[in-house]
């Protein structure tokens, strides 16, 4: 798979492959994988990809199921890249406060917060 | 501050306090703090709170600015609790795939993805 494929297209294709291979993936009835209790997905990327690793090691490879796991590893690579950009730029307090305000604003409007 | 205050109310109050104390917080003109390059904030919570720690250590405490940092530490506590819930429950592949599908769907529609 060329890594030049835009991440957004990669995600769309992966969603389709996930539906296609569902039956094969659920074949192992004893396997248990951590599933987050909440929907703040970005907080749980590490656990999600650990789960994908567990699933991959238990799934018979070949054909397009291999492409599914390859796609997922490219998505992980993208997210890891995003995480590296979290602390890459040292800015003035003003810019940090703007970002903090934005972060809290997003938390206020978009996060799934339990009472 | 009672930790019983709902997190959503805590976030709102913190946003207000941030505006109130902006002038005091930006007083240190030499201080530089890592600021994420992208807007996928949840990926960067660790770095954001490290930055808050740096800012707190450089800010003269007292009055409601102390409340601001107390609030921010309660928000961190909430996020840490959410992170603990990422891997707490081991479920069957079926549930994991439903969650993975949701995660990829959210990535597809809500994440800020650079080309």
């Amino acid at each position: 798979i060329p890594t030049e494929i835009p991440t957004s297209a990669l995600v769309k294709e992966t969603l389709a492959l996930l539906s296609t291979h569902r039956t094969l993936l659920i074949a192992n009835e004893t396997l248990r994988i951590p599933v987050p209790v909440h929907k703040n997905h970005q907080l749980c990327t590490e656990e999600i990809f650990q789960g994908i690793g567990t699933l991959e090691s238990q799934t018979v490879q070949g054909g397009t199921v291999e492409r599914l796991f390859k796609n997922l590893s490219l998505i992980k690579k993208y997210i890891d890249g995003q995480k590296k950009k979290c602390g890459a730029e040292r800015r003035r307090v003003n810019q940090f406060l703007d970002y903090l305000q934005e972060f809290l604003g997003v938390m206020n409007t978009e996060w799934i917060i339990e009472s | 501050i009672p930790t019983e205050i709902p997190t959503s109310a805590l976030v709102k109050e913190t946003l207000a306090l941030l505006s109130t104390h902006r002038t005091l917080l930006i007083a240190n003109e030499t201080l530089r703090i890592p600021v994420p390059v992208h807007k996928n904030h949840q990926l960067c919570t660790e770095e954001i709170f490290q930055g808050i720690g740096t800012l707190e250590s450089q800010t003269v405490q007292g009055g409601t600015v102390e409340r601001l940092f107390k609030n921010l530490s309660l928000i961190k506590k909430y996020i840490d609790g959410q992170k603990k819930k990422c891997g707490a429950e081991r479920r069957r592949v079926n549930q994991f795939l439903d969650y993975l599908q949701e995660f990829l769907g959210v990535m597809n529609t809500e994440w800020i993805i650079e080309s």
């Epitope: 004893t30 248990r32 599933v35 987050p36 209790v37 909440h38 929907k39 799934i112 339990e114 009472s115 | 081991r90 479920r91 069957r92 079926n94 549930q95 439903d98 969650y99 599908q101 949701e102 769907g105 959210v106």
Partner: antibody, heavy 119, light 107 residues
Framework: QVQLVQSGAEVKKPGASVKVSCKAS????????INWVRQAPGQGLEWIGY????????RYNQKFKGRATLTVDKSTSTAYMELSSLRSEDTAVYYC????????????WGQGTLVTVSS | DIQMTQSPSSLSASVGDRVTITCKAS??????LSWIQQKPGKAPKTLIH???RLIDGVPSRFSGSGSGQDFTLTISSLQPEDFATYYC?????????FGQGTKVEIK
């Protein structure tokens, strides 16, 4: 407070369809899955399926697949359960129930909607 | 599908009695089991989740135990308002399945 309020009782003829609504209030609708459960007169409880209002994804008990359709209207925080090709054995009270987390326990239940199928 | 077998199907007891209801799953469901109470003509109400975790507001006389395939609901001292039907529910795998219910009646 968190509430699920269901639509009123329905009487339908065999072969017809019924659509039961479940209006959520007191919480963010997209945060929790909505499950549907039914109970025939004097019988036990039976899971029909769940819908995730976050992404409109639904999953069904095979027994109801093809006949039950779960949908949501995010603008009104309402979940719907439509059952087609009704037969007399579909006479039951239909409940919606909120999932506390992801595939978790049912923490809030609707009051139930009686659907009677009779010619 | 996972079968849930509840026993007894009904029991008669007096106020103050200790009551035990059991539920057996046809396969390992970890601890993903809840206990539900239903009074005649009313909506069900969840009492316990994750096999042994009491839901807020539920009296402490209710307790749950077990993991894997065998589970128990205990009411330590039966109260008049506890006369109802009790169901177990496995939410470990799809489709979720209920036990057939245990009716607790006044002796």
């Amino acid at each position: 407070q968190v509430q699920l309020v269901q639509s009123g009782a329905e009487v339908k003829k065999p072969g017809a369809s019924v659509k039961v609504s479940c209006k959520a209030s007191g919480y963010t609708f997209t945060n929790h899955h909505i499950n549907w459960v039914r109970q025939a007169p004097g019988q036990g409880l039976e899971w029909i399926g769940y819908i995730n209002p976050y992404n409109d994804y639904s999953r069904y008990n095979q027994k109801f697949k093809g006949r039950a359709t779960l949908t949501v209207d995010k603008s009104t925080s309402t979940a719907y359960m439509e059952l087609s090709s009704l037969r007399s054995e579909d006479t039951a009270v239909y409940y919606c129930a909120r999932d506390y987390g992801n595939f978790w326990y049912f923490d809030v239940w609707g009051q139930g909607t009686l659907v009677t199928v009779s010619s | 599908d996972i079968q849930m077998t509840q026993s007894p199907s009904s029991l008669s007891a007096s106020v103050g009695d200790r009551v035990t209801i059991t539920c057996k799953a046809s396969q390992d469901i970890n601890s993903y089991l809840s206990w539900i109470q239903q009074k005649p003509g009313k909506a069900p109400k969840t009492l316990i989740h994750r096999a042994d975790r009491l839901i807020d507001g539920v009296p402490s006389r209710f307790s749950g135990s077990g993991s894997g395939q065998d589970f128990t609901l205990t009411i330590s001292s039966l109260q008049p308002e506890d006369f109802a039907t009790y169901y177990c529910l496995q939410y470990d795998d799809f489709p979720y399945t209920f036990g057939q219910g245990t009716k607790v009646e006044i002796k």
